[in-house]
Interface confidence: low
């Protein structure tokens, strides 16, 4: 069974978390977005979403990067910094962000009821919207065998974590990995939770 927690869409960009923890590889992220009739957002698309109110406290894939969008400074989220944070060492599993080009240009909180591009498969997939509504379907979206049959069978049991790295600026972005948390192998969010993604300072 796979639970997919999704947020509202902001200029088409939304956050997806699998099984309440960081548990999505880059290849699975692309497949997952495709199943949502979406793609991995570009940095420009993420910045647009940020500009109209999209923020999370979870690392997720976009095209070429792993990021957290932050609007409001929060001492326990990205050390009070704001902007699109890029994780410099992306060797783990994370959540993902997706971009749906046909979504409204502003905020869209209507419920997502299915994975329109999922194909036939045996997996029970539950879509959990931010308001708690749940929609269940059978199917599959993963195409990479390594995502379907992970080498570490305990990944689905892993808890969340934190990340910490020193921050520096480059190219207009702040490169940041959390300080005071774990790298979660996963959780429920734009959401920091108790599952596995702390990334320590370097």
């Amino acid at each position: 069974q796979i639970d997919l927690n999704i947020t509202c869409r902001f200029a088409g960009v939304f956050h997806v978390e699998k099984n309440g923890r960081y548990s999505i590889s880059r290849t699975e992220a692309a497949d997952l977005c495709k199943a949502f009739n979406s793609t991995l957002p570009t940095m420009a698309q993420m910045e647009k979403a940020l500009s109209i109110g999209f923020e999370t406290c979870r690392y997720g894939f976009i095209e070429g990067h792993v990021v957290i969008p932050r609007i409001h400074p929060n001492s326990i989220c990205a050390a009070n910094n704001t902007g699109v944070y890029i994780l410099t060492s992306n060797t783990s599993q994370y959540d993902t962000y997706c971009f749906n080009a046909s979504a409204p240009p502003e905020e869209d909180c209507t419920s997502v009821t299915d994975l329109p591009n999922a194909f036939d498969g045996p997996i029970t997939i539950t879509i959990v919207n931010r308001d708690g509504t749940r929609y269940v379907q059978k199917g599959e979206y993963r195409t990479n065998p390594e995502d379907i049959y992970p080498s570490n069978p305990t990944d689905d049991d892993v808890s969340s974590g934190s990340s910490s790295e020193r921050s520096s600026t480059s190219g207009g972005y702040i490169f940041y990995t959390f300080s005071t948390v774990h790298p979660i192998p996963d959780e429920d969010s734009p959401w920091i939770t108790d599952s596995t993604d702390r990334i320590p300072a370097t």
Epitope: N5, S92, Q93, G161, D194
Partner: antibody, heavy 118, light 112 residues
Framework: EVQLLESGGGLVQPGGSLRLSCAAS????????MRWVRQAPGKGLEWVSS????????EYADSVKGRFTISRDNSKNTLYLQMNSLRAEDTAVYYC???????????WGQGTLVTVSS | DIQMTQSPLSLPVTPGEPASISCRSS???????????LDWYLQKPGQSPQLLIY???NRASGVPDRFSGSGSGTDFTLKISRVEAEDVGVYYC?????????FGQGTKLEIK
């Protein structure tokens, strides 16, 4: 400043019920996973339950599964623990804690004492 | 469930001297992402627990650098380079690899 304030503890008879609350302030409550951890008098720490930011995912220790229910009201910035069919061994100080990452409980409340006795 | 075992359970230390606490898990806490899901907490007398070390070796915000964590897999160590009076309390290790999160029995550090 992050603050977590537990309430609802007290004396209850075996088999009784109690609802603990944890009022959160100083951070964006709806973004974070929360948990309950307890400590029996003179004993060590025991994880009780966790809940994801939206409340969609909950987890429980085997010792409380089926008896305790964790929930949250993000509009009220409040975490709850509904405890039913209480037993003497549930006697403990119950802490709510904010998770800021994998398993990390960086902020804890001051705790509320639950005493189960006849 | 993953079992956590700490030693010693009691640790009398002279101020200024080093201290070391061991924590062993019943199965490896090393995740495939390269991180060890092991935390250390300190509970001072009459207070709530506070996070000292996360992911085996990373100091939480505000924790003095005299505290350090090390180890990998199933064997971990918390070291205090020079114990101060304010360090008294009970130290707990906790595995965060999988639920149920489990704690060690605790090590009570006291000043000689």
């Amino acid at each position: 400043e992050v603050q977590l304030l537990e309430s609802g503890g007290g004396l209850v008879q075996p088999g009784g019920s109690l609802r603990l609350s944890c009022a959160a302030s100083g951070f964006t409550f709806s973004l974070y996973r929360m948990r309950w951890v307890r400590q029996a008098p003179g004993k060590g720490l025991e994880w009780v339950s966790s809940i994801s930011p939206s409340g969609g995912i909950t987890e429980y220790a085997d010792s409380v599964k089926g008896r305790f229910t964790i929930s949250r009201d993000n509009s009220k910035n409040t975490l709850y623990l509904q405890m039913n069919s209480l037993r003497a061994e549930d006697t403990a100080v119950y802490y709510c804690a904010l998770d800021v990452g994998v398993g990390a409980a960086d902020y804890w409340g001051q705790g509320t004492l639950v005493t189960v006795s006849s | 469930d993953i079992q956590m075992t700490q030693s010693p359970l009691s640790l009398p230390v002279t101020p200024g001297e080093p201290a070391s606490i061991s924590c062993r898990s019943s199965q490896s806490l090393l995740h495939s992402n390269g991180y060890n899901y092991l935390d250390w907490y300190l509970q001072k007398p009459g207070q709530s627990p506070q996070l000292l070390i996360y992911l085996g070796s990373n100091r939480a915000s505000g924790v003095p650098d005299r505290f350090s964590g090390s180890g990998s897999g199933t064997d971990f160590t918390l070291k205090i380079s020079r114990v101060e009076a304010e360090d008294v309390g009970v130290y707990y290790c906790m595995q965060a690899l999988q639920t149920p999160w489990t704690f060690g029995q605790g090590t009570k550090l006291e000043i000689k």
